[in-house]
Amino acid sequence: VTEHVLANNDVSCDHPSNTVPSGSNQDLGAGAGEDARSDDSSSRIINGSDCDMHTQPWQAALLLRPNQLYCGAVLVHPQWLLTAAHCRKKVFRVRLGHYSLSPVYESGQQMFQGVKSIPHPGYSHPGHSNDLMLIKLNRRIRPTKDVRPINVSSHCPSAGTKCLVSGWGTTKSPQVHFPKVLQCLNISVLSQKRCEDAYPRQIDDTMFCAGDKAGRDSCQGDSGGPVVCNGSLQGLVSWGDYPCARPNRPGVYTNLCKFTKWIQETIQANS
């Protein structure tokens, strides 16, 4: 199972990239450092494209020191992020308003510390149910064209809904190549039956599948990042097959409509 998380300039999750058998699952987290290899081809996210600047102002990067991106996250409140629970680390930094993967200064960027990380109590490592976590920032954001929260959808997604997923995760799989700038990819929500057929006995109502037949997918390093449908936050990048973008093996996303009450109550209780 591949969690889409990154660490130390290479895939570093439950299964390092050189040891994961084809057809296994993985959480989608990893580690794109400041010296990560960039990919100059048109192959993005996997088969996405460069996001237009200023179009994803809720997109956050979670960084290990010095500047290693290991997960994405989403600004959902002036002082709170959502990300995947499997992205939890004790020491990390948060970068908002940044377009490129490289740590070079950008005028719109805002840097933060996480002062509190609250995983959903129903999450169970190394499983995938309830894969979400709230992060409280050390101060409120300064709203700009580059940094702005997005609302979490209270409506569950229906099959066929068109959505946009974004992140700085690897653009090739099983090789690891990181993009120069934030990647965007249009995907479609699949029916829960197709999702369950793709991953028997691994899917529950805290997850949904999305993708297409053309080998488009999120991948290592995208974990915790946003899936936006009809202008609101529908999901978080969670897990998928390894290698990424395999036919009939869609990406699996945290189904945030099931958690709106928990998100609201947790933010209120900790503000």
């Epitope: 004790k90 020491v91 509190k116 609250i118 490592h125």
Partner: antibody
């Protein structure tokens, strides 16, 4: 070599202040959270508090108002101060490093502090 | 506040025995639980973190399981060097916490 070494007075008078330092070597403090833990003689482990590279500090609820955890600007040592001590504060005091996945993977050898007049 | 309760507080076992120690949290801590081994006069040693991940250099006879509120440390075949005290520690939250550690379980020779 990755190492932690606690040091400080072994004897503190009641109502006084206990002051300990933890010297860090072999890794940058800027990458890790550090914890202080104590163990009264013959008893279990007690968490005192954590300090993060950003100087954010979490204290055990019993320690708030009595404990101060800090780190120096060069990031080579972590300090613990415990005020208004009583005999109940007699313990072996440990500093430890968090592995960034919520496990304390490196510990100092510990230092015994006795509170007595 | 989250309280951690270990059981039993002590147990007697023989070399080769399978030993199980449990740790219960007063509310869900998801998978943020670590286990430590401590021998007399020594600092604790990390055995397991994230409930089931074996720390570097720890023998495979040690294993951890559980999530939510109930956790288990298992030693599949007790060795002479395993006689020690074992502690669990929650890492879910530091807010309003008296102690993150459980009370300990002493494993003695039968």
């Amino acid at each position: 070599e990755v190492q932690l070494q606690e040091s400080g007075p072994g004897l503190v008078k009641p109502s006084g202040t206990l002051s300990l330092t933890c010297a860090v070597s072999g890794f940058p403090l800027s990458n890790y959270a550090m914890s202080w833990v104590r163990q009264p003689p013959g008893k279990g482990l007690e968490w005192i508090g954590d300090i993060y590279p950003s100087d954010i500090i979490d204290y055990a609820s019993w320690a708030k108002g009595r404990v101060t955890i800090s780190q120096d600007s060069s990031k080579t040592q972590v300090s613990l101060k415990l005020s208004s001590v009583t005999a109940a504060d007699t313990a072996v005091y440990y500093c430890a490093r968090d592995n960034n996945d919520y496990g304390l993977d490196i510990w100092g050898q510990g230092t015994l502090v006795t509170v007595s007049s | 506040a989250i309280d951690m309760t270990q059981s039993p507080s002590s147990l007697s076992a023989s070399v080769g025995d399978r030993v199980t120690i449990t740790c219960q949290a007063s509310q869900s801590i998801s998978s943020w639980l670590a286990w430590y081994q401590q021998k007399p006069g020594k600092a604790p040693k990390l055995l397991i973190y994230l409930a089931s991940t074996l720390a570097s250099g720890v023998p495979s006879r040690f294993s951890g399981s559980g999530s939510g509120t109930d956790f288990t440390l298992t030693i599949s075949s007790l060795q002479p060097e395993d006689f020690a005290t074992y502690y669990c520690q929650q890492g879910y939250t530091n807010s309003n916490i008296i102690n993150t550690f459980g009370g300990g379980t002493k494993v003695e020779i039968k």
